[in-house]
């Protein structure tokens, strides 16, 4: 499988937003690339979001996706929004070179995203 690199650890912002770069080493001249973010908890793997893009064009996730992203060459900048403390976990970047053949697939080692829910503001009397 292709080599896919991603940071080991990312801390989500207080607004529940986490961003990281997923970079892949392409063996060939792909024109169509699919990027999928997977969350792994123990032996369970769930798909967080996915997007297919044409090289040179923007990465487009579905309207209701919690992910957004941009692409530049063999790099994809991914942002996951709406994260809560319970979403802390290992997020894996999966890259597939869909077209033209041959098909290549690469899996990153995963980014551990830590999410801390903000403390509620104490009531204050004025």
């Amino acid at each position: 499988a292709m080599h896919v690199a991603q940071p080991a650890v990312v801390l989500a912002s207080s607004r529940g937003i986490a961003s990281f770069v997923c970079e892949y080493a392409s063996p060939g001249k792909a024109t169509e690339v699919r990027v999928t973010v997977l969350r792994q908890a123990d032996s369970q793997v769930t798909e967080v979001c996915a997007a297919t893009y044409m090289m040179g064009n923007e990465l487009t996730f579905l309207d209701d996706s919690i992910c957004t992203g941009t692409s530049s060459g063999n790099q994809v900048n991914l942002t996951i929004q709406g994260l809560r403390a319970m979403d802390t976990g290992l997020y894996i970047c999966k890259v597939e070179l869909m077209y033209p053949p041959p098909y290549y697939l690469g899996i990153g080692n995963g980014t551990q995203i830590y999410v801390i829910d903000p403390e509620p503001c104490p009531d204050s009397d004025f």
Partner: antibody, heavy 115, light 108 residues
């Protein structure tokens, strides 16, 4: 039209060597990781090994059953991949297929190891 | 090394039947799985790549599903020309890119 043509198979005695060749055409050879897959008579498919391409420094990988005996190499200028088989055993008897990625397959060449 | 276990090893079904073949990996392989069809006396042919993607020229009655460790190849309506042996293969690094043991499909 994509074509992969294997050659070099035949009858060989145990302990001897054989070199298989696979000539590719109809696709961008240099973009492909090339594999060898074999199939013993009446048996299933067995992945033998792989050679990656220039962006991956022509890394090679082998199944445990052939490691240390078989060597894969490639010549991108000629679009050929080779399988050098040394210290052959009777259990190496099989049809050997060359594949481009895993998308394109050759017709196979038969290797028989027997005394 | 990751082991690939296919079941059943053989099956017999009627024309028009829905046929399901399963492939299990001993570890998570994230959808890094191909399916191949090998008709008697012929060269194997790529059917499904990346667990779910139909290869060019493959009839739509074939489909692949699954993720993690459990994968399925489904033929929605078995045809006489589907008589073959079907193999799954793990395509996740590091190699070996192990094949399953195969499933022989016959017509009743």
């Amino acid at each position: 039209e994509v074509q992969l043509v294997e050659s070099g198979g035949g009858l060989v005695q145990p302990g001897r060597s054989l070199r298989l060749s696979c000539t590719a055409s109809g696709f961008t050879f240099s973009d492909n990781w090339m594999n060898w897959v074999r199939q013993a008579p009446g048996k299933g498919l067995e992945w033998v090994g792989q050679i990656r391409n220039k962006p991956y420094n022509y890394e090679t990988y082998y199944s445990d059953s052939v490691k240390g005996r078989f060597t894969i190499s490639r010549d991108d200028s000629k679009s050929i991949v080779y399988l050098q088989m040394n210290s052959l055993k009777t259990e190496d008897t099989a049809v050997y297929y060359c594949t481009g990625g895993m998308d394109y397959w050759g017709q196979g060449t038969t290797v028989t190891v027997s005394s | 090394d990751i082991q690939m276990t296919q079941s059943p090893s053989s099956l017999s079904a009627s024309v028009g039947d829905r046929v399901t073949i399963t492939c299990g990996a001993s570890e998570i392989i994230y959808g890094a799985l191909n399916w191949y069809q090998q008709k008697p006396g012929k060269v194997p042919k790529l059917l499904i790549y990346g667990a779910t993607n139909l290869a060019d020229g493959v009839p739509s009655r074939f489909s692949g599903s699954g993720s993690g460790t459990d994968f399925t190849l489904t033929i929605s309506s078995l045809q006489p020309e589907d008589v073959a042996t079907y193999y799954c293969q793990k395509i996740l690094s590091p190699p070996p890119w192990t094949f399953g043991g195969g499933t022989k499909v016959e017509i009743k």
